[in-house]
């Protein structure tokens, strides 16, 4: 299924503190699932993989094709 590469951003994007475990976002994740379709503006974000939207963070992340790594699946995995 490829490698899942998430941004290192915490749930803090939508909370008062970067380390805070925000109840609102946790509830949102449970209700709607952890991922949703990426907004259209991120159509070309993932270079060698597919984009998904992290609901709790409201940010895109990439699921890399086999043999690729990196936040945007932009690097060849030399160990693959």
């Amino acid at each position: 299924d490829g490698n899942s590469t998430r941004s290192p951003e915490t749930n803090g994007l939508l909370c008062g503190d970067p380390e805070e475990n925000c109840a609102a976002t946790t509830t949102q994740s449970k209700r709607k699932g952890h991922f949703s379709r990426c907004p259209k503006q991120y159509k070309h974000y993932c270079i060698k993989g597919r984009c998904r939207f992290v609901v709790a963070e409201q940010t895109p992340s990439c699921v890399c094709d086999e043999g690729y790594i990196g936040a945007r699946c932009e690097r060849v995995d030399l160990f693959y």
Partner: antibody, heavy 116, light 106 residues
């Protein structure tokens, strides 16, 4: 606490250039997408550009594409906006804001005035 | 580009009133919508994200609803500190804001 502090605004002639900076503190800067949003005097909000957490992805509003460049230096916790070929319609308060899609923290803004 | 149309552009209300602001997208944006409050001379403040989720620290009198093209921000009981301008923002195709709704004291 989270703080974003913009600087670099001022008066510039049409066709001129300006570089804005945004100093971030109170959070792990390198973990966040950051954006520039502007507001012309007495007008509404207009998103300008955003950059991902490591600086490998940028996106721009059509109104500034080809003239403005967003960048960041994670070692300095600083965001930049290089503005070239400035026009009168670029006159606005420029805010840096945390996030790429949604903006949960904003700076106080810096005023850019483009006039001859 | 996706256009965001807010209505009304301004409204007068009294403390304790229930206030509703609507935002319409020119095309479907699923639930990729946020609401902001801005007071004169200040930066905007995020109230609602993903159309209906309350941002941390925002009073529960604020609520959002809608999906697709039609969205609503409701203030259940207007407080003195709520007099401000409110903006919707879509984040599906690029990021665009509505023109704003100014909530004034009646």
């Amino acid at each position: 606490q989270v703080q974003l502090l913009e600087s670099g605004g001022g008066l510039v002639q049409p066709g001129g250039s300006l570089r804005l900076s945004c100093a971030a503190s109170g959070f792990t800067f390198s973990r966040y997408w950051i954006s520039w949003v502007r507001q012309a005097p007495g007008k509404g909000l207009e998103w300008v550009s955003h950059i991902n957490y490591e600086g490998t992805w940028t996106l721009y509003a059509d109104s500034v594409k080809g003239r403005f460049t967003i960048s960041r230096d994670n070692s300095k916790n600083t965001l930049y906006l290089q503005m070239n070929s400035l026009r009168a319609e670029d006159t606005a308060v420029y805010y840096c804001a945390r996030g790429g899609s949604l903006f949960d923290y904003w700076g106080q803004g810096t005023l850019v005035t483009v006039s001859s | 580009d996706i256009q965001m149309t807010q209505s009304p552009s301004s409204l007068s209300a009294s403390v304790g009133d229930r206030v509703t602001i609507t935002c319409r997208a020119s095309q479907g944006i699923i639930s990729y919508l946020g609401w902001y409050q801005q007071k004169p001379g200040k930066a905007p403040k995020l109230l609602i994200y993903a159309a209906s989720s309350l941002q941390s620290g925002v009073p529960s009198r604020f609520s959002g609803s809608g999906s697709g093209t039609d969205f609503t921000l409701t203030i259940s009981s207007l407080q003195p500190e709520d007099f401000a301008t409110y903006y919707c923002q879509q984040y599906d195709a690029l990021n665009t804001f509505g023109q704003g709704t100014k909530v004034e004291i009646k």
